[in-house]
Every structure is written in C-alpha cells, then in structure tokens.
C-alpha cells in the first residue's frame, strides 16, 4: 500500500540502486517515486553531514522485503516511493530554495527582475530543468538578477551548494505550466536523427511516448515496431534529444513510428503509467512472482498491488491453467521495461498500474461565513482541490467553495445550503483559477447527493459540514485532484504552514474576487479562540486560524473552502471555512470546522452502495 | 429571545445539600458553556465553574472546588449547581449565564440562605 | 491565582459628567477583561470585552482601554440607568473579578 510516513534523523542502510542531489526530501522522494526500481530513500539535509560531497545527497533504495534496516543519523530525513499513491503522484515540483545554487550545465542566462520570472523562463524553455537566480543583494554586482538555465544527464543538479542571496528551483512543465505547448502528432514511418539518450523496450509508440514525457532529457523519440526489418531492434524505443530541441532531420522510414514528449503540454499531461492490456503479446523479464488468478484484469491488480511488480504476463497456455485460474508472471527489470517482447503468443502483457494518479474511486485520508482578506492570486494548479459552487437561477454566481477529496466527492460547508438545498441549481466547477474563464461552455459537475451532517442547524456554528456527491466521478490531472484528509482526531500534529483559499471578497463588504486567492494564516488554540468569542462556544470540532493583528483571513463566498496545511511534504485539509466574526478583524481569528473530528463521519458517508469504502489510506 | 429562568429562594440548614436549577430558553444548553457565579451579601461576584452540557466537561475555580457540583440535562434544556456540606459562607444569591469566552447573558439569580 | 483591585470602591457624580473606574491585575492578562454593569435583582449586564471592545446594543458613551495589567473603563455623559455596581473579569487565566464600584449620582 501507500506509505507517506518519514522518518526524522534515519539512513536507510543498503539497497542503493541510485544517487543524486536534490534540494529536499521531497524532491528526493519524488524521484525515488518515478525510479522503476526505488522504494525507498534516505536525505542528507546540508545541515546533517560535514562532508561536502554527501551534501544534499538522495539515496535511492530497493529492497526485496520492502524494508531496510534504518540507522540513527542526526538531520537525515528517510521515506517511502509514492508508488501507489494515486493523485498524489506528481513530477511537479513548485518549491523556489532560498540560499541554494543548484549547479549544472549552464545553458542560458539573461537579467530578470525576479525568481518568479526565472522560474518562468525556464519553464518556458524546452531544455531547461532547474534555473538558480542571484537576487538583488548577490555580493557580486555584475552577477544581480542573472536568472541561469540549467540541465544536467539525470535532471537533477550535478552538485548543489550553500550560497548565499542565491535562489534556485525547477521547471514547472512537470506541473503542465509551461507556455511552449506540444506535437501530439505520431508520425508513421518516420524516423527522427539526432542523439540517443536511452533505449528500452515498449509494446508500441504511446508507451514510448509516455516514457520519452517523464524521462528528463528526452525530446522526442523514435519507435521501431514489431515488423521492422532488423530483429533485434524490434520494439526499441529510441528516446532522443538535440541542441535546437526539435530532430535535426528525419527519415522516411516503414515501420517506425515517431513523435514527441508531451511534458510542454499546457494544462494536461499524460499519466506517468501505461494502463493498456497486450493480447498475444509476452513481456519478459526478471521474475518477481508467479501467482495463479481469474483472468487479465486481476493479473494486473496483482501487479499493481505488488509494489516492486512493473509488468506482468498472464499465459493462457493450458500447462499454465488450471480450472478457471492460469498463471500471472509478475516481473521487473531494471529499467521498467520489458527487457523482450515476443508476439504471437497466448498470453496476455501490461504493466503496473502503480503510478497511475488516478488511483482507485476513493477519498483520500492519511493514518497517522466567510473569503480571503489579505491575500495574493494564486497560480493554476497551486490549489488543485479547491471548488467552486454556484447557483444558477436566473443568473449564475459563485457562493461557496468547496474541496475535492475523492474522484465523486466534495466536501463543503452546511451553510452554504441554508436557504438551497435543491441539488438541481447547483453548478460545480473544479479545475479553474479565474471565475471569468467560465462561460456557458466550461464543463461543470452536477449534485447527485448533498449529504449535510445530521446535527447541523441553520444559522448555527456548530457541524458546519456537508458531503456532495457528484453525478459523475471527475478524472484527476494537475488542476484537478484531491486534497487529504487528517487522521481521525489528529491532535498531536502542530501545523505551521497553513493557508485558506477562496473566491470570496476581498474585504467586509466587498465582492467576489475572480482571481482564486491564497492566504498563510496560522493557526490559533481553541482556547486563545474562545477567548476572542465571548458569545459563541469554540468546541473540540472547530478549530480557530488568524493574525492578532488581523488583516488576513477568509470572508464571504470563502465558506466551505479548505484550509489546508503542509505537514512533512503533504497538504492536508485541516479545516472547512466555517464563520467569524465579521472578516480579518483584530483579534477575531476565523473558525473553521475540524476535519478530523467528521472522518468517522466522512467515512460511514462515502461508502459505496456496496459497502467498499471509498478511503483510500496513503499511510 | 434568550432567557435563563432559575429556581426561586431556597432556605436550608447548615450540613445540608441544595440544589439549584438554571434552565435555558431561546437556545439549546449544548451549543454554550453555562457558568455559575456567587455573590455574597454586600461583597462582590466570584466565579464558581463552568460546564460544557455537550460532553459534561466541568472546571471549577481551585478555591470552591468539592464544595460545587455541575451537572446538566440537555434534555430539558437545565443546569445545575449543586452545593453540599453549608455553612453560613454560603449563604449568597448564585447565578447562572451562558456564553463562550465570557458570561454574556444571565440568568435573575437565586438566593440561598443558610440558617439554623 | 490573578487577583484584580477595582478602585474606587465607590463614587458619587452628577448626570451628564464622566467617571473612570480602574482595576489593577496582579498579572499581566494580555487585555482580557471585560466590564459588567449589574443592578439590584438582576443579574449583570456585559457592556465590553477584550479590553474595549463594546457588546452589540451597548451605548457607546461607555468605553474601555488599558494594557498589561492597568486598565480603565469610563462612562461619558452620565444617565439615570446608569446608576449601578460596576465590576471588571478577567478572563486570561479562568475568571477573577474586581471588587466591584457602586456608581451613586450626587
């Protein structure tokens, strides 16, 4: 299953399969995630080791029980791959580190007047993967506001250093952000020239494709398929780069099939998987496991659950059955892929559905009257779960926000339906930034269920939650996928990284923004909050976030919006924008409902009608 | 409208116990705290305790602590304070009031005498 | 324990004049006291929280400022109704109220 835990001051010892530099753990376990062989990995923080060559080293592991033996070391940080993990899957990486130069080729370099802008441009430029830039107080005058462009043969940094008034960070096309755009075109018999930058065996051109996308130095690529004229090129997947960054020249060339990685797409990439099942197809490779089941399908679950499984065959050979089961190879190599493909056979090939992000058809939880004042635009898909609700009588506005926490749920705010509960007005609308993007095309979801908790009354603070399910489950992508919830009753964990988001106004009396704003509010105790409302009783199932001084908080049209917070790597949703006394005033923190005092609740309701429930548990 | 309605005047012994009633309209007891408080004939008010009627919760000022009871019955919307072994230094009028951080309404009070 | 002295203990004023009442905590109670006005055979009256921060359907002649541990509360412009016992809570570390100020007019 999911493991989201990290372990504090522990080095896993052993199992190296590879090694890198990367600013955090995060990052680091973002590449363990996407490593076909990595299920665990171990950090050193700058801080954790004197010896400069290890700083900032990620140690990527493999372990045939799925454990290795941890040391104590002071500073080092250690985890889990994210394989399995559903939405929570990503190559997308936003965070800017201060103090840090991330080194590498330096391919380009121009004056910016900020980090943002340099991030910017690298995103924007085809070969760049990380960028560092020398900020306005950089001790070398000549050297202030260079915004450097960086790439490297792996996509991480060739070494990272301590530097002083130094920002560095990575592309953001892993996020879909970047402005250059994509060829989804698959050119037939055609072959690309230019340098090869790895080769692996795929059963046609989209697995090629997908694998060219998520590989760091691949452009564009070359596939040969299965009739081409030399055998042992059969299937190659050649994954292919260039100077210029498009192929040189190409060849006409029958049975190849060539094209392009699709990481510049705007606004949608590919899973990092390859769902598709081969009939008559075999894969080859080492074998992990060899399990007797009912049929392809269960063949693959078992791959997929099977966290070290990367492809599978299912032989239909009578030798390989018995009754109704036949036999399920479950199998690895040490790139991912199959290390022989052979057709015309009675088996049946695919892979792993492991980090598929689309994940099972769950909500999402760990084990372990209101709008934002005082806030700043938020960017696409900085805040992927949260919502829109609007009504459509006879015009259509925006007056609640909500959050997706399952493929068919959003949980919300009761109070958003004082006065509405008809689920027909109801227009959902998930995946946006701007309210003015919508028109009357823009897809929306429609209520199935408005499930509002039995002991909330109108117009009182208390239970101030509702479920809504969905007519039909969204897809998840990286403008669009659910936020976790907390453990039930999650006391112990101090969050201090927490932000409200919202279309809500701007000020007390004020309108709705068109621009999703994001604000950093801490949070406040229920007792510290209880002391601010003299006439309203703060219980155990609110929890309290605001500046003594005010100035920033939630507001009207906010209501039934997240308030997350960022816990070891992971965004949680903490609370639900709930009510306050009027909005950011001084010392009147807003009360937002506590999630983890409903996850029984949450659960019983988000059952399916088959009683599966529909909790995924990344921890 | 809110409105606390509490027991009338209650005359007792000393030794014996006696208990108060503060019962709520306008609002349900669950969704506040209710407090009580004791002013002494010519003194000032002190405060005795609080309950939570949602889950029984109770504190008490350290100094009166053993000598007062909380209780509540959400079912008819009523506190209690209950006042056991009396003394003389108990004779006061108490009173009830509801809030969150603060005593924000009250109820008229009761006057407890305690008199041989 | 916070203990709170309220001063003067009593004071006599005529209508339409102004009176301030004090309390000292013995603590520092980050401002949060609040001022109760309470007259024969009822039970009290809030009038202001957190310091200065005046209950809905309180006439603003009535004000409170103060920090630390001294605090102040005032009654501008003096009417009949006002005539009262007036106590000040503090409310930082569970509750202890003042010994209370009897407001006669002259």
């Known amino acids: 299953g999911c493991l989201t835990q990290l372990y504090e001051n522990a080095f896993f010892r052993g199992g190296d399969v590879a090694s890198m530099y990367t600013p955090n753990a995060q990052y680091c376990q973002m590449r363990c995630t996407f490593h076909p062989r990595c299920l665990l990995f171990s950090f050193l923080p700058a801080s954790s080791i004197n010896d400069m060559e290890k700083r900032f080293g990620c140690f990527l592991k493999d372990s045939v029980t799925g454990t290795l033996p941890k040391v104590h070391r002071t500073g080092a940080v250690s985890g889990h791959s994210l394989k399995q993990c559903g939405h929570q899957i990503s190559a997308c990486h936003r965070d800017i580190y201060k103090g840090v130069d991330m080194r590498g080729v330096n391919f380009n370099v121009s004056k910016v007047s900020s980090v943002e802008e340099c991030q910017k441009r690298c995103t924007s430029n085809i070969r760049c993967q990380f960028f560092s830039y020398a900020t306005q107080t950089f001790h070398k005058a000549e050297y202030r506001n260079n915004c450097l462009l960086k790439y490297s043969p792996g996509g991480t940094p060739t070494a990272i250093k301590v530097l002083s008034n130094v920002e560095s960070g990575f592309s953001l096309k892993p996020c879909a952000l970047s402005e250059i755009g994509c060829h989804m075109n698959i050119f037939q018999h055609l072959a690309f020239s230019d340098v090869d930058v790895a080769r692996v065996l795929t059963p046609d051109a989209f697995v090629c494709r997908t694998i060219c996308t998520y590989h760091p130095n691949c452009l564009f690529f070359t596939f040969y398929t299965n009739v081409w004229k030399i055998e042992s090129q059969r299937n190659v997947c050649l994954l292919k780069t260039s100077e210029s960054g498009t192929p040189s020249s190409s060849t006409p060339q029958e049975n190849t099939i060539s094209g392009y990685s699709l990481l510049t797409c705007k606004r949608t990439l590919p899973e990092p998987c390859h769902s598709k099942i081969y009939p008559g197809v075999d894969f080859g490779g080492e074998e992990l496991n060899v399990t007797f089941v009912k049929g392809v399908n269960v063949c693959q679950e078992t791959c997929t659950k099977m966290i070290r499984c990367q492809f599978f065959t299912y032989s239909l050979l009578p030798e390989d059955c018995k009754e109704e089961k036949c036999k399920c190879f479950l199998r690895l190599s040490m790139d991912g892929s199959p290390t022989r493909i052979a057709y015309g056979t009675q088996g049946s090939s695919g892979y792993s559905l492991r980090l598929c992000n689309t994940g099972d058809n769950s909500v999402c939880t760990t084990k372990t009257s209101t709008r934002i004042v005082g806030g700043t635009n938020s960017s696409w898909g900085e805040w992927p779960w949260q919502v829109s609700l609007q009504v459509k009588l006879t015009a259509q506005r925006h007056l609640c926000g909500g959050s997706l926490i399952g493929h068919q749920w959003v949980l919300t705010a009761a109070h958003c339906f004082d006065g509405l509960p008809l689920q027909d007005v109801w227009r959902i609308y998930s995946g946006i930034l701007n309210l003015s993007d919508i028109t009357k095309d823009t897809p929306f979801s429609q209520i199935k269920e408005i499930i509002i908790h039995q002991n909330y009354k109108v117009s009182e603070g208390n239970h101030d939650i509702a479920l809504i399910k969905l007519q039909a489950p969204l897809n998840y992508t990286e403008f669009q996928k659910p936020i976790c919830l907390p453990s039930k009753g999650d006391t112990s964990t101090i969050y201090t990284n927490c932000w409200v988001t919202g279309w809500g106004f701007s000020k007390e009396k004020g309108e709705i923004q068109n621009i999703l704003q994001k604000v950093n509010i801490p949070l406040v105790t229920n007792e510290e909050c209880q002391k601010r409302y003299q006439d309203y009783k703060i219980t155990q199932r609110m929890v309290c976030a605001g500046y003594k001084e005010g100035g920033k908080d939630a507001c009207k049209g906010d209501s039934g919006g997240p308030l997350v917070c960022k816990h070891n790597g992971m965004w949680r949703l903490v609370g639900i924008t709930s009510w306050g006394e009027g909005c950011a005033r001084r010392e009147q923190p807003g009360v937002y409902t506590k999630v983890a005092e409903y996850m029984d609740w949450i659960l019983e309701k988000t059952q399916s009608s088959d009683g599966k429930a529909q909790m995924q548990s990344p921890a | 409208e809110v409105q606390l309605q509490q027991s009338g005047a209650e005359l007792v012994k000393p030794g014996a116990s006696v208990r108060l009633s503060c019962t709520a309209s306008g609002f349900n007891i669950k969704d506040t705290y209710i407090f009580w408080v004791k002013q002494r004939p010519k003194q000032g008010l002190e405060w005795i305790g609080r309950?939570?009627?949602?889950?029984?919760?109770?504190k008490y000022d350290p100094k009166i602590q053993g000598k007062a009871t909380l209780t509540a019955d959400t079912s008819s919307n009523t506190a209690y304070l209950q006042l056991s072994s009396l003394t003389s230094e108990d004779s006061a009028i108490y009173y009830c009031a509801k809030g969150g951080g603060l005593f924000a309404y009250w109820g008229q009070g009761t006057l407890v005498s305690v008199s041989a | 324990d916070i203990q709170m002295t309220q001063s003067p203990s009593s004071l006599s004023t005529s209508l339409g004049g102004k009176v301030t009442i004090t309390c000292e905590a013995s603590?520092?109670?980050?401002?949060?006291i609040a001022w109760y006005q309470h007259k024969p055979g009822k039970g009290p009256r809030l009038l202001i929280h957190?310091?200065?921060t005046l209950q809905s359907g309180i006439p603003s002649r009535f004000s409170g400022s103060g920090s630390g541990k001294d605090y102040s509360f005032s009654i501008s412009n003096l009417e009949p109704e006002d005539i009262a016992t007036y106590y000040c809570?503090?409310?930082?570390?569970?509750?202890?109220f003042g010994g209370g100020t009897k407001l006669e007019i002259k």
């Open positions: 603590h520092d109670i980050n401002n949060y």
């Open positions: 957190y310091t200065s």
């Open positions: 809570l503090q409310y930082d570390n569970l509750f202890t």
């Open positions: 309950i939570d009627p949602e889950n029984d919760n109770t």
